[in-house]
Amino acid sequence: QPSVSPGEPSPPSIHPGKSDLIVRVGDEIRLLCTDPGFVKWTFEILDETNENKQNEWITEKAEATNTGKYTCTNKHGLSNSIYVFVRDPAKLFLVDRSLYGKEDNDTLVRCPLTDPEVTNYSLKGCQGKPLPKDLRFIPDPKAGIMIKSVKRAYHRLCLHCSVDQEGKSVLSEKFILKVRPAFKAVPVVSVSKASYLLREGEEFTVTCTIKDVSSSVYSTWKRENSQTKLQEKYNSWHHGDFNYERQATLTISSARVNDSGVFMCYANNTFGSANVTTTLEVVDKGFINIFPMINTTVFVNDGENVDLIVEYEAFPKPEHQQWIYMNRTFTDKWEDYPKSENESNIRYVSELHLTRLKGTEGGTYTFLVSNSDVNAAIAFNVYVNTKPEILTYDRLVNGMLQCVAAGFPEPTIDWYFCPGTEQRCSASVLPVDVQTLNSSGPPFGKLVVQSSIDSSAFKHNGTVECKAYNDVGKTSAYFNFAFKGNNKEQIHPHTLFTP
């Protein structure tokens, strides 16, 4: 019995005065607690407790279930205990099959013994299966067997407490160990789409998938810079013991423009947190924005090819696209395709392929596109660069020599005189009159220039050259002169095309 200094309250004393008592099943248990301030006896086994306010605890016919710790407490809160084993060969273990383990922690298999003198108190696997090699345990006859540092691999492990009695192995009822995993990584979160574009009134629904080792993972949808609670629905699955998946679906049944913003799916566990975001843009109505990929004014040489290319954003998706020239719609020579195969793509490309353009094919080429909400168009002004062509070269009745040339860009006409039989005409002659004429063709057609010189200035036989040129090339026409007496006579004019 404990000894204390005089004057200080002392713990109660128990008779019999020993820490452990062994009785046989059917025998009497008689425990006496002596203390002037006696309060109660408490009996504990398998974490369950019973109380008795009598200072003498008497059990007339002891049963195995009377095995346990008997504690006497006084009014000062001081106590003393005795542990009683009720030896019953037919019931060697008291069992509570509640067996939960947390990964990396210890857990107690509650199978205290009714007889401390049996041997080889240990754990065994069910149906003769061996225990995992790394499973370590510590037996305690009064409490059970402590499994040290529970592993995830022990989940649903079936085991028995075991002792040797008279040379034979005796097993307890079976225990099934349920292991809760420890979080050793942050949750894995993903979102069904990274961005959403909707019209007002349409439903917004986005799903976040959270993956972790158990359903204890916390997750929520949050709106950035807002505390408002969002309505979400859950579905979840266990793909095996430590592979848990939750789908958290956020829905706004009728989205408004002010619902636009960034939504975050946030998940955390005891290890850490993870998040993923999705962006919602709500527009009051659909739109189309066209972006030319080349200048809308295009210059191209006669006979060459050109591609007219536009990119455009269309929401909702485009329904009709066409290329038009001179009120005629192209049925081929163009292609239209999405810029990406991404499900949320709203950007498209349209290309019109113009091949071997003729001078007469300049003009306005228009791309038109529409969706259920809007129409949009863009025009390309195509100019075809052509080498000058001399349309007329005549001697007029008033003695003027006139040269009319057409081309694009606007040709320049220069005049030269070659005396006698010289081949090279180098002496330039200033024109009397130069006019740009209105073409009767389309506004993007060739430009026509008329230039005149006075032939009276020429006093000798020779050749007059009319040379029309622009950035693309040059063409010449010639007037041959011969004098008969005082009369000047025009010999047939002819042209020489100079490359």
């Epitope: 398998l46 974490d47 369950e48 407790t49 019973n50 509570d96 099959r97 509640s98 067996l99 939960y100 947390k102 922690n105 107690l108 509650r110 649903r156 225990f175 099934i176 349920k178 809760r180 158990s214 359903s215 204890s216 699955w237 266990h238 848990y244």
Partner: antibody, heavy 116, light 107 residues
């Protein structure tokens, strides 16, 4: 002898917070799991949440955003707090002890009415 | 979450019949299934745990079985005292889930 007893207000105003206590005796909270289960009048049982023996908690998915379960082992008490109550939270709330044998012990339940 | 689909919702049986109540789990729950009986105004009482094992004090006319993810509670030759509502509960993983209940009336 194992016992569980629920206590708390019988009437809660809508949008207010419910606080319930489950006081246990005859066993230790560090050895057993204690669950909260509720049952609206005339309806089925609904699992609310659980306090694990090591102090961890698990919750019903539909309620977890407004639910919290805690404990005081020295007083052998488990607490349930649920905020933003609505009429559909009207129910008898039970606490129950689980071992591997199932929910072997139940409290008698406490009726909580959500009404103004 | 794991759904437990319980059927029938109610049944009326005579004392000579064998009553069968079933619960189907939406995914595998191993043997983590228990059955409870509840009488009006009372707390539920454990009948069967681990699919087949009878809780202390439960008469042997109650039995449990499993086929895949379908679990059954059988009451052979039910007695008047067996009337009440029966629930299954999966404890395979949190969140735990109950079946919707079966109301048993005895003629």
């Amino acid at each position: 002898q194992v016992q569980l007893k629920e206590s708390g207000p019988g009437l809660v105003q809508p949008s207010q917070t419910l606080s319930l206590t489950c006081t246990v005796s005859g066993f230790s909270l560090t050895s057993y799991l204690v669950h909260w289960v509720r049952q609206p009048p005339g309806k089925t049982l609904e699992w609310v949440g659980l306090m694990w023996n090591d102090g961890d908690t698990s919750y019903n998915s539909a309620l977890k955003s407004r639910l919290s379960i805690s404990r005081d082992t020295s007083k052998s008490q488990v607490f349930l707090k649920m905020h933003s109550l609505q009429a559909e939270d009207t129910a008898t709330y039970y606490c129950a002890r689980e071992s591997n044998l199932g929910f072997t012990y139940w409290g008698h339940g406490t009726l909580v009415t959500v009404s103004s | 979450d794991i759904q437990m689909t319980q059927s029938p919702a109610s049944l009326s049986a005579s004392l000579e019949e064998i009553v069968t109540i079933t619960c189907k789990a939406s995914q595998g729950i191993d043997d983590d299934l228990s059955w409870y009986q509840q009488k009006p105004g009372k707390s539920p009482q454990l009948l069967i745990y681990d699919v087949t094992r009878l809780a202390d004090g439960v008469p042997s006319r109650f039995s449990g079985s499993r086929s895949g993810t379908q679990y059954s509670l059988k009451i052979s030759r039910p007695q008047v005292a067996d009337s009440g509502i029966y629930y299954c509960l999966q404890s395979y993983s949190t969140p735990y889930t109950f079946g919707a209940g079966t109301k048993l009336e005895l003629k």
